[in-house]
């Protein structure tokens, strides 16, 4: 229903704490360079204004849209042009163009230093002094680095953070309590970020229909006992929630997500038998829990998919009468039978089925034409299954770091023009798929591997869009989202690439590497590996292994030496010479 004052409505629905958190996230995602204090001041002003509207919905400006209110606030920031350049031009536009303009200026790779975690004692001190400010800093720092982070989920992670600090700051050994727990939250939040970015990409590039198809497949896998009408309702609601968050309408998004969680918990009987545990939790935990609830048990008596979609004489008639509904029921029926497939694969199968009907229904004898469609699915299914087997075998043999290196070599050969930091980031993220998915039961591996890889490759595409350098990457990124991963997998060595000159300074290291944390050491070594491949794209695996083993030995020796600096300056040039010879 329409409300006299949108801002009062959202404040009442969400409550002050969530309202302030969401406004802070929204401002931090739009203006990524502003300090926490600048944003905190704006948030307080907006909150005070919302309270006046709650008291009197007819008060001045209370009837304005949230975009107008928030946009006016952002545009009133001093030195906007100096700090944000052409983003300031957005302020010359009217709504809704102004908001669209802000969205277009969101930066997926902002020039911000990595978010460093303070040491335990300092963290606990500032947390105890002012938990609200501490959490505000967390929301601000994550939101500005991840401008599409799913806002209600970020509130959930902040709540997790809060609980961990409350528990660990009371312990004697704060460090050993905090580190593993916060690392766990960080890992989950980073995965959540790339997954949500993928959803927003789907929405931005291919529209609501594409996202809704994704939602139908995903929900049908999770709730195979729900009927098609129920799945359609959930998919429609979920599409609305995501559209709002991707569009920067964070208050509406969080409010609608809470409504959806409420609906699911009130209708468990027609959705799934697995929801009760989630529904017993408070709001943020409930919505998070529902988003990753385990699959319900599949009905035992499902007929073969062929009955309605191949053998039925009415296929083309049903397709003609309501294409989207018919294809939606196909996607629903296929997905509920295959929780072991990735959503990407299910969407490729639905696309193949649609293309088959488009072709066959135009023929004089359609049933004879589409009769073999399910058999034609086989190669589409086998390809990702082989990918999972090959990659999980390799991961089990090499471990995470070795597996990342293998991927780094592979992807540097596919797209050597891409910047080394981007290749290293991508390979490290792609390599984590092993730890994340290969340890799962067989029937969960494929959906885990492929949907995670698709999300990581979406980030590769977003970064490449800013500075397109590789035709290979442009080709794979230009197609549909579900075809990207197979496209990248199919890429081979880029024959058009002119190898980089060998520069000794690229492979020159100093003693400061010895004191770096293990992760940073790995990144240094992987940077060198990518540069080696750019120098010799057709180097064999053996040659690269020889060089990397030599490099690791060199680091180990010099970092243990009494005079590290001398070791690096004398042994370094010898290492460079050996590398050149090994790759000659």
């Amino acid at each position: 229903e329409a409300h006299k004052s949108e801002i009062a409505h959202r404040y009442n629905d969400l409550g002050e704490q969530h309202f302030k958190g969401l406004v802070l996230i929204a401002f931090s995602q739009y203006l990524q360079k502003c300090s926490y204090d600048e944003h905190a001041k704006l948030v307080q002003e907006v909150t005070d204004f919302a309270k006046t509207c709650v008291a009197d919905e007819s008060a001045a400006n209370c009837d304005k849209s949230l975009h107008t209110l928030f946009g006016d606030k952002l545009c009133a920031i001093p030195n906007l042009r100096e700090n944000y350049g052409e983003l300031a031009d957005c302020c010359t536009k009217q709504e809704p163009e102004r908001n669209e303009c802000f969205l277009q200026h969101k930066d997926d790779n902002p020039s911000l230093p990595p978010f460093e975690r303070p040491e335990a004692e300092a963290m606990c001190t500032s947390f105890k002094e002012n938990p609200t400010t501490f959490m505000g800093h967390y929301l601000h720092e994550v939101a500005r680095r991840h401008p599409y982070f799913y806002a209600p989920e970020l509130l959930y992670y902040a709540e997790q953070y809060n609980e961990i600090l409350t528990q660990c700051c009371a312990e004697a050994d704060k460090e050993s309590c905090l580190t593993p727990k916060l690392d766990g939250v960080k890992e989950k939040a980073l995965v959540s970020s790339v997954r949500q970015r993928m959803k927003c990409s789907s929405m931005q590039k291919f529209g609501e229909r594409a996202f809704k198809a994704w939602a139908v497949a995903r929900l049908s896998q999770t709730f195979p006992n729900a009927d098609f009408a129920e799945i359609t309702k959930l998919a429609t609601d979920l599409t609305k929630v995501n559209k709002e968050c991707c569009h920067g309408d964070l208050l509406e998004c969080a409010d609608d997500r809470a409504e959806l969680a409420k609906y699911m918990c009130e209708n468990q009987a027609t959705i799934s038998s697995k929801l009760q545990t989630c529904c017993d939790k408070p709001l943020l935990k409930k919505a998070h829990c529902l988003s990753e609830v385990e699959h319900d048990t599949m009905p035992a008596d499902l007929p073969a998919i062929a009955a309605d979609f191949v053998e039925d004489q009415e296929v083309c008639k049903n397709y003609a009468e309501a294409k989207d509904v018919f294809l939606g029921t196909f996607l629903y029926e296929y997905s509920r039978r295959h929780p072991d497939y990735s959503v990407s694969l299910l969407l490729r199968l639905a696309k193949k089925y649609e293309a088959t009907l488009e072709k066959c229904c135009a023929e004089a004898n359609p049933p004879a034409c589409y009769g073999t469609v399910l058999a034609e699915f086989q190669p589409l299914v086998e390809e990702p299954k082989n990918l999972v087997k090959t990659n999980c075998d390799l991961y089990e043999k090499l471990g995470e770091y070795g597996f990342q290196n293998a991927i780094l070599v592979r992807y540097t050969q596919k797209a050597p023009q891409v910047s080394t930091p981007t290749l290293v980031e991508a390979a490290r993220n792609l390599g984590r798929v092993g730890t994340k998915c290969c340890t799962l039961p067989e029937d969960q591996r494929l959906p885990c591997v492929e949907d995670y890889l698709s999300a990581i490759l979406n980030r590769v595409c977003l970064l490449h869009e800013k500075t397109p350098v590789s035709e290979h990457v442009t080709k794979c990124c230009s197609g549909s989202l579900v075809e990207r991963r197979p496209c990248f997998s199919a890429l081979t060595v880029d024959e058009t690439y002119v190898p980089k000159e060998f520069k000794a300074e690229t492979f020159t290291f100093h003693s400061d590497i010895c004191t770096l944390p293990e992760k940073e050491k790995q990144i240094k070594k992987q940077t060198a590996l990518a540069e080696l491949v750019k120098h010799k794209p057709k180097a064999t695996a053996e040659q690269l292994k020889t060089v990397m083993d030599d490099f690791a030995q060199f680091l180990d020796t010099c970092c243990k030496a009494a005079d590290k600096d001398t070791c690096f300056s004398t042994e370094g040039p010898n290492l460079v010479t050996r590398c050149k010879d090994a790759l000659a």
């Epitope: 004489q313 009415e314 296929v315 083309c316 008639k317 397709y319 003609a320 009468e321 488009e358 229904c361 135009a362 023929e363 004089a364 004898n365 359609p366 049933p367």
Partner: nanobody
Framework: EVQLLESGGGLVQPGGSLRLSCAAS????????MSWVRQAPGKGPEWVSS????????LYADSVAGRFTISRDNSKNTLYLQMNSLRPEDTAVYYC????????SSQGTLVTVSS
């Protein structure tokens, strides 16, 4: 909403001719193969003839081959069935369908062949 409206039926003497039409709406007509199906009193539906979306391919039941001709005009969203050398056993309700469907989703048009 898909709609199919047949016309052109009537009473005709054996050996005579009729031309049936089917006006289609509510879907992309040119993208679908179309068929004519008939149902004689007290009997089940019987497939008569089919044509591809472009009109380039046609198929006929043995019982009508050489006597009936299926055609279409995609600019008018209309399907036709030219019936020559009609026989008493051709008496039936004729209806057009989408694809290979045998079920009727329209009223059909009655063709009676009798002297």
């Amino acid at each position: 909403e898909v709609q199919l409206l047949e016309s052109g039926g009537g009473l005709v003497q054996p050996g005579g001719s009729l031309r049936l039409s089917c006006a289609a709406s509510g879907f992309t007509f040119r993208s679908f193969g179309m068929s004519w199906v008939r149902q004689a009193p007290g009997k089940g539906p019987e497939w008569v003839s089919s044509i591809s979306g472009s009109g380039s391919d046609t198929l006929y039941a043995d019982s009508v081959a050489g006597r009936f001709t299926i055609s279409r005009d995609n600019s008018k969203n209309t399907l036709y069935l030219q019936m020559n050398s009609l026989r008493p056993e051709d008496t039936a309700v004729y209806y057009c369908t989408i694809g290979g469907s045998l079920s009727r989703s329209s009223q059909g048009t009655l063709v009676t062949v009798s002297s």
